[in-house]
Every structure is written in C-alpha cells, then in structure tokens.
Interface confidence: medium
C-alpha cells in the first residue's frame, strides 16, 4: 500500500508512517515503528504538557517569584501550567501576570470605593458632600464630617471634600 501523506487526529507522520501523539501530561520517548507503538513518558513533578504532542521535553511550570510580588493562585499539574497572581496590595501588569505593580492611592478629596484585588487596581471615588479625605491612601475611605451638633458645638468652618468641619463653642447670649 501507498505510504500515507496525512494522518488522523492525534497522530503525526514520521518515516512515511502515522504514529500516535503523546497525550497531555506525557512526552515523547521514541517514535512508533512498523512493529511498536509510540513510547511516551509522564512529565516530571514540576513539568507539564497541555496538548497532544510529540515533544521530547516537558515545559517547566511557571515560577511565581515572590520578589516580583507573585504567589501561586493555582498549582500546576502534569497537564496544566501554574497560574500566578499578585500578593495583597498589588495587581498584575498583564494577563499573563508575569509581574505586579503597586495598587494606586486615592488622592485627598477621594476615598477608596473598592480595595484592589490581585487582578484589579484600587477604585477611587470623589468624596460626596458631607464626607472628606485629607490623605493619599490605598485603603482609606471618605469619612463623614464631624457632627458639631451632637457635641453641643457649632460649625465654625465648613468642611470640604478634603477637610473636616471645624467645630467651636456656641455664642452665649449675655443677659
């Protein structure tokens, strides 16, 4: 019979012969022959292959480098790579999450609406009327102005989105 020019799915052509590919999680040791099947071996502990393949070497699992702010989100298997994410307070610079950047701070006049996660940055919001933030922070929310009335005091200086109100004593009417 004529030697094949194309092979079925999960096969590859070598020496005019169709050999089975190695399944995910295994690497090629030797091609098949007229008399023997393809020989495959499982990947080592820190290695993986995620497709049907004829690779002679498995890929190394990604290293989540703590010095780049990375930690393991999902441990790799023989068929999947390790997935990294960022430590608290940082977020990924790309979808591949190869390094992390510090979450931004919210400037005075803005408060933290949502603390950042491993994949998303800090969300800031302007402090509405009645609230203020006088610092640059990645954690501080807008805080309500002090209520002078509850302290039996009066407002001496109005608050802004960046400053609290200033309370003072009530003017006593003299008899």
């Amino acid at each position: 019979p004529e030697p094949p020019t194309a092979c079925r799915e999960k096969q590859y052509l070598i020496n005019s012969q169709c050999c089975s590919l190695c399944q995910p999680g295994q690497k090629l040791v030797s091609d098949c022959t007229e008399f023997t099947e393809t020989e495959c071996l499982p990947c080592g502990e820190s290695e993986f292959l995620d497709t049907w393949n004829r690779e002679t070497h498995c890929h190394q699992h990604k290293y989540c480098d703590p010095n780049l702010g990375l930690r393991v989100q999902q441990k790799g298997t023989s068929e999947t790579d390790t997935i990294c994410t960022c430590e608290e307070g940082w977020h990924c610079t790309s979808e591949a999450c190869e390094s992390c950047v510090l979450h931004r701070s919210c400037s005075p006049g803005f408060g933290v609406k949502q603390i950042a996660t491993g994949v998303s940055d800090t969300i800031c919001e302007p402090c509405p009327v009645g609230f203020f933030s006088n610092v640059s922070s990645a954690f501080e929310k807008c805080h309500p102005w002090t209520s002078c009335e509850t302290k039996d005091l009066v407002v001496q200086q109005a608050g802004t989105n960046k400053t609290d109100v200033v309370c003072g004593p009530q003017d006593r009417l003299r008899a």
Epitope: G69, L102, V135, A138
Partner: nanobody
Framework: EVQLLESGGGLVQPGGSLRLSCAAS????????MVWVRQAPGKGLEWVSA????????YYADSVKGRFTISRDNSKNTLYLQMNSLRAEDTAVYYC?????????????WGQGTLVTVSS
C-alpha cells in the same frame, strides 16, 4: 532621618499571642499608609496587613484574617500588630514599613525586623 524600630517578637507556643510594635520617626507618620510584611526562613516577603493614615481602614492577607489585628497610635507615631492564635507557619521576621511605591522588595523605608518563632 527616617527610622522604623520593631519590637515585641519572641518565642511563643502554637495558639499563643504576641503584640508587635513599630516606633516611627523622621517622617509624617499620620499621613502615610503603613504595612506589616514578613519573611519566613528561605521564603520571599509576604504582605501581612496594612492600615490607612487615620487607622480607620485596615486590610489583611487571607492567611492572617481573623487572627491578627493592625492598629496605630498617631499621637505616639507607633504601629502595632496584635497576633493571636499563632501557628507554626507564622514563624518569620516581621517588618513594618511605609507602604512602598515600587515592587515588593523596594520598600521606601523599613526597620530591621523582629523575629517571631512559633514552636512547642
């Protein structure tokens, strides 16, 4: 000159408690986010907890949530970390730091650290 001086570390049994302190000087303490980070033997730096300038807003790593409490006394320029229900995996050198502006290792200012050993 900026200085951060941690204290309060020591040897404690699993389940025990410790309170770490960090005395700060040389910068506007009450205007900065502050953090505690730790480094276990042979491991990288791990973010433990952070606190906003007013002290009203706090943030914890999942590994310490419900067990550790961060606080600050701006009148004393001091940062605290109350550690309860300590576990062997909490063994590390603990550092206080200004919240950094770059990658994890590039803290703008941080102290010499205090060693916490959890062992029976």
């Amino acid at each position: 000159e900026v200085q951060l001086l941690e204290s309060g570390g020591g040897l404690v049994q699993p389940g025990g408690s410790l309170r770490l302190s960090c005395a700060a000087s040389g910068f506007t303490f009450d205007g900065r986010d502050m953090v505690w980070v730790r480094q276990a033997p042979g491991k990288g730096l791990e973010w433990v907890s952070a606190i906003s300038p007013s002290g009203l807003d706090t943030y914890y790593a999942d590994s310490v949530k419900g067990r550790f409490t961060i606080s600050r006394d701006n009148s004393k320029n001091t940062l605290y970390l109350q550690m309860n229900s300590l576990r062997a995996e909490d063994t590390a050198v603990y550092y206080c730091a200004e919240r950094p502006q770059m990658l994890v290792t590039n803290f703008d200012y941080w102290g010499q650290g205090t060693l916490v050993t959890v062992s029976s």
